[in-house]
Amino acid sequence: GSEGETFFQKPESCPPVPGGSMKLDIGIINENQRVSMSRNIESRSTSPWDYTVTWDPNRYPSEVVQAQCRNLGCINAQGKEDISMNSVPIQQETLVVRRKHQGSSVSFQLEKVLVTVGCTCVTPVIHHVQ
Amino acid sequence: NFPRTVMVNLNIHNRNTNTNPKRSSDYYDRSTSPWNLHRNEDPERYPSVIWEAKCRHLGCINADGNVDYHMNSVPIQQEILVLRREPPHCPNSFRLEKILVSVGCTCVTPIVHHVA
């Protein structure tokens, strides 16, 4: 058989799911895993950033934290901004569940969301703009 | 409040249509705290492939292209949500899982603790 046939269990051993849908348990595995936020790398970085919390009651999780680079350039050894270098955002995709209200009915949709995680300092690409 | 179990549409909506995925593809090389990307693959997870960043150096790259140990390269980590097949191997039954990934690296002023 094909790779897919051998990989998946026989349908009877899996929960029945309506066509075009998937069953999703939103009780999170590893819920208590935490990033060490005490490191303060966002303020110690040569490309520092700030955090903004976005909140949406129809999204799970309702809170998503986004980073924004503080400067266009990078901070040099003297603590001054060096605009010969660039602060740029580093981004990562994550999944969220979106609740949609259509009249009296409610449906759920998975969404890919791009989160800015932090910033890094890069050598600029020369665009030769006059 | 969200119910514990929901039925969701198989099509995953992508809200990132206004971003160019190639835009940041070379930051790993141009950064003063460059990193390598390592493929982490798990067929029981969606997405099945996640790229993990590993900082290349202990220090940061200075203007001369040398490693400067007065500064430290550190990973930027993020918790993300992925789907885990539950029960295992089932094509359309999942549970949300939180995983910690290193997305890239940044150059920081050191907190001198144990390095002379």
Partner: nanobody, 123 residues
């Protein structure tokens, strides 16, 4: 769970040499640096050396510079510490560990340590 097994420690005369080995397993996908540390009797554990898995660049504490050399074998997931011109003050239990934040890793962030390997330098 990270597992660390250090070996190679011994009793040696001042001026002698030793090579310590450390086998690491269970490292996370983002692990990018390893370190050697030591703890002398009645003293706090201190940093000795660090190495990047990718570039192989190294950093040493001042007291061992020019005498100790750290290296790694990526395929075996092992790191080594070549110790030359040993001095009595190098006497300690030597430990290796993953450095999840590289040189930025604080001592209080380590959860797990291996058994270590005893190095004794007699005068």
């Amino acid at each position: 769970q990270v597992q660390l097994v250090e070996s190679g420690g011994d009793l040696v005369q001042a001026g002698g040499s030793l090579r310590l080995s450390c086998a690491a397993s269970g490292l996370t996908g983002s692990s990018y640096a390893m370190g050697w540390f030591r703890q002398a009797p009645g003293k706090e554990r201190e940093f000795v050396a660090a190495i990047s898995w990718i570039s192989g660049d190294t950093k040493y504490t001042d007291s061992v510079k020019g005498r100790f050399t750290m290296s790694r074998d990526n395929a075996k997931k092992q790191v080594y510490l070549e110790m030359n011109s040993l001095k009595p003050e190098d006497t300690a239990v030597y430990y290796c560990n993953d450095m999840p934040y590289g040189l930025d890793t604080r001592m209080d962030e380590y959860v797990y340590w291996g058994q270590g390997t005893q190095v004794t330098v007699s005068s």
